[in-house]
C-alpha cells in the first residue's frame, strides 16, 4: 500500500477579520494509526493550534467527526479571526508510539492571510487658528488594516486636493498596517463653512470608502474690518457715532471706545448677525453730547478679536462747527442700544 500523504490543497486562504477560517487537510490512508495535530509555523518554535488527542482549543472546530474510524478529513475551522492569526498552518500526522506519539508526515502548509478593515479616519487640524491666505496642515490617520494596499484622497468642499504626502507603515510585511497623511490647505475668507475630508478606500470596504472630516470653522480666523461713522441724532447737540465691525470669525470679540485716548466703555459682542459665508457683523454706537466739549474729540473704536492684538479705527469729532452728517449706517445689519453722554 502507498505511504500516507498529508494533503493541504490550499496554498493560501484569505479571510476577513472577525470571520471563520477553514483550513483543509486530508490524509490519503488510515495507516499508520495516530492523531493529527495542527501547528502554526514549521520549526521547533511552532505553536500548537489543535491536537486531536487532548487540549483546550476554544476557537477551533473540526469540519468532520474525527472519532469515526474511517475518517481521513482533518480540516479545521478557526473562529473570530484577527490579524494576529496570520501565518502558515501545517497539518501534521503523528504515528502512535510509546510513551509518546512520533511525528510522521506534514502537509505543505496553508498561508492564512487576514483582511482587516481600516479604522475610521481621524482628521486633525492645526493647534492654533490661522487667517485667510495662510497655508495650514491637516493630518489624517487610519489603523489596523490588511492587506497593505490602500488609497487615500483629500477633498475640500468636494474638490480633490493634490498637495499632500502619505505614508503607510510599516514599510515591510506586517499583520496590520497604518496610514498617515498630511495635506496642505490654503485658507480663504469664505472658508468658515468649508470642510476638509480625508477618504480612505480599501479592499475590505467593498467600494464604500471611509471618511473623516474637519470643519475649517475650527481652524480659521477671519479678522474684522472696522468702520467708524457719525450721524446727527435727536437734538442738534447730540451726535451718534457708530463702529461697524464686519466679516469676523469666530464670534469672540471685545470692543473698547476711547475718547481722546481714555477708555470710555468696553463691551463684548453678543447680539451679532451672521452673514451667508458664516462670518459675523456687529455694531456698537456711542451717543456724544457735543455741547459739553470745547475742543475737537478723537473717538477711537478698538477691537480685540479672538485674543489677537487690538485693531482700531478713529474718528475726529468737530465740535466747533455745527455737526453735519458724515457717514451713513447702511452697512449695519444690527443696531445696539448703547448710549454714552459725554458731560
Amino acid at each position: 500500500e502507498e505511504e500516507l500523504q498529508v494533503i493541504q490543497p490550499d496554498k493560501s486562504v484569505l479571510v476577513a477579520a472577525g470571520e471563520t477560517a477553514t483550513l483543509r487537510c486530508t490524509a490519503t490512508s488510515l495507516i499508520p494509526v495516530g492523531p493529527i495535530q495542527w501547528f502554526r509555523g514549521a520549526g521547533p518554535g511552532r505553536e500548537l493550534i489543535y491536537n486531536q488527542k487532548e487540549g483546550h482549543f476554544p476557537r477551533v472546530t473540526t469540519v468532520s467527526d474525527l472519532t469515526k474510524r474511517n475518517n481521513m478529513d482533518f480540516s479545521i475551522r478557526i473562529g473570530n479571526i484577527t490579524p494576529a492569526d496570520a501565518g502558515t498552518y501545517y497539518c501534521v500526522k503523528f504515528r502512535k508510539g510509546s510513551p509518546d506519539d512520533v511525528e510522521f508526515k506534514s502537509g505543505a502548509g496553508t498561508e492564512l492571510s487576514v483582511r482587516a478593515k481600516p479604522s475610521a479616519p481621524v482628521v486633525s487640524g492645526p493647534a492654533a487658528r490661522a487667517t485667510p491666505q495662510h497655508t495650514v496642515s491637516f493630518t489624517c490617520e487610519s489603523h489596523g488594516f490588511s492587506p497593505r494596499d490602500i488609497t487615500l484622497k483629500w477633498f475640500k468642499n468636494g474638490n480633490e486636493l493634490s498637495d499632500f504626502q502619505t505614508n503607510v507603515d510599516p514599510v515591510g510585511e506586517s499583520v496590520s498596517y497604518s496610514i498617515h497623511s498630511t495635506a496642505k490647505v490654503v485658507l480663504t475668507r469664505e472658508d468658515v463653512h468649508s470642510q476638509v475630508i480625508c477618504e480612505v478606500a480599501h479592499v475590505t470596504l467593498q467600494g464604500d470608502p471611509l471618511r473623516g472630516t474637519a470643519n475649517l470653522s475650527e481652524t480659521i480666523r477671519v479678522p474684522p474690518t472696522l468702520e467708524v461713522t457719525q450721524q446727527p441724532v435727536r437734538a442738534e447737540n447730540q451726535v451718534n457715532v457708530t463702529c461697524q465691525v464686519r466679516k469676523f470669525y469666530p464670534q469672540r470679540l471685545q470692543l473698547t471706545w476711547l475718547e481722546n485716548g481714555n477708555v470710555s466703555r468696553t463691551e463684548t459682542a453678543s447680539t451679532v448677525t451672521e452673514n451667508k459665508d458664516g462670518t459675523y457683523n456687529w455694531m456698537s454706537w456711542l451717543l456724544v453730547n457735543v455741547s459739553a466739549h470745547r475742543d475737537d474729540v478723537k473717538l477711537t473704536c478698538q477691537v480685540e478679536h479672538d485674543g489677537q492684538p487690538a485693531v482700531s479705527k478713529s474718528h475726529d469729532l468737530k465740535v466747533s462747527a455745527h455737526p453735519k452728517e458724515q457717514g451713513s449706517n447702511t452697512a449695519a445689519e444690527n443696531t445696539g442700544s448703547n448710549e454714552r453722554n459725554i458731560y
Epitope: 495535530q37 501547528f39 502554526r40 509555523g41 514549521a42 520549526g43 521547533p44 518554535g45 511552532r46 505553536e47 500548537l48 493550534i49 491536537n51 487540549g55 483546550h56 482549543f57 501565518g87 502558515t88 501534521v92 503523528f94 510513551p99 509518546d100 506519539d101 511525528e103 502548509g109 498561508e111 510599516p170 514599510v171 515591510g172 510585511e173 506586517s174
Partner: antibody
C-alpha cells in the same frame, strides 16, 4: 497578560548541578514551545534549549547536550531546566521565553543568575 | 551554525535623529517557500530582559512604536529608528529564527543618547 518568572539560580561549583524553574501564566501554556536563552557576562545572547508544543520534542545547543535537560509540566504551567556537569562557561543570566510561532522569542522572563565558580 | 554579525557595536545619537544599525548572516535567511526572511530584532534596556521588536525581518510586534522599522532580505538586514527618543537607549540584538538549529544571535549594537 503573559508572565514568566524564573527561579533556582545561584552559585555552584564546576561539575555541580542546578535546576531552574519557570512559572508561566496568562496564556495556554501547552500550546506554545518554551525555551531557555542565556546571556553571558559579556552580554552575548545564546539559545540553550527548547521544549516544543504538541509532543515531547526537545532541542538543545550542542555544547549543553547530555548535560542539560529541558522538561515541562503542562498541568502546572511550568518549564524546567536541569543542569549538571556545570562549567564556568555556563555562567550567565538564564531567561525563560515563550517562543513565537516560527522561532523568535516573543516573551521573556526577568531572568535568574547562574554563577559557576570554584 | 549560522553566524550573525552586527555593526556598529555601539553608536551615540541625539534625540530626533535617524538611527540605522545592521545585521549580517553567514547564509541566507530567506525561505523560498513563503518568501519570508527569518530574522528578529530585540531591544534590551539597561537592567531589563530583552523585548521582541520585529520578526520576519519587518513585521513589527504588537505595541512596538512605528519609529522602529526592520528591512532587508537574504543576508543583509537593517533596523532603523526613524526619530530616536531618550527611552530608546538600549542594546539591540538580531536573531535568525530559521528552522535550522541552533537559533543564533548577533553580538548586539549599543545605542547611546548624546
Amino acid at each position: 497578560e503573559v508572565m514568566l518568572v524564573e527561579s533556582g539560580g545561584g552559585l555552584v561549583k564546576p561539575g555541580g548541578s542546578l535546576k531552574l524553574t519557570c512559572a508561566a501564566s496568562g496564556f495556554t501554556f501547552s500550546n506554545h514551545a518554551m525555551s531557555w536563552v542565556r546571556q553571558t557576562p559579556e552580554k552575548r545572547l545564546e539559545w540553550v534549549a527548547t521544549f516544543g508544543s504538541g509532543g515531547s520534542y526537545t532541542y538543545y545547543l550542542d555544547s549543553v547536550k547530555g548535560r542539560f535537560t529541558v522538561s515541562r509540566d503542562n498541568a502546572k504551567n511550568t518549564l524546567y531546566l536541569q543542569m549538571s556537569s556545570l562549567r564556568s562557561e555556563d555562567t550567565a543570566m538564564y531567561y525563560c521565553s515563550r517562543s513565537g510561532w516560527d522561532g523568535w522569542f516573543a516573551y521573556w522572563g526577568q531572568g535568574t543568575l547562574v554563577t559557576v565558580s570554584a | 551554525d549560522i553566524v550573525m554579525t552586527q555593526s556598529p557595536s555601539s553608536l551615540a545619537m541625539s534625540i530626533g535623529q535617524k538611527v540605522t544599525m545592521n545585521c549580517k548572516s553567514s547564509q541566507s535567511l530567506l525561505n523560498s517557500n513563503n518568501q519570508k526572511n527569518y530574522l528578529a530584532w530585540y531591544q534590551q534596556k539597561p537592567g531589563q530582559s530583552p523585548k521582541l521588536l520585529i520578526y520576519f525581518a519587518s513585521t513589527r510586534e504588537s505595541g512596538v512604536p512605528d519609529r522602529f522599522i526592520g528591512s532587508g532580505s537574504g543576508t543583509d538586514f537593517t533596523l532603523t529608528i526613524s526619530s530616536v527618543q531618550a527611552e530608546d537607549l538600549a542594546n539591540y540584538f538580531c536573531q535568525q529564527h530559521y528552522s535550522t538549529l541552533p537559533w543564533t544571535f548577533g553580538g548586539g549594537t549599543k545605542l547611546e543618547i548624546k
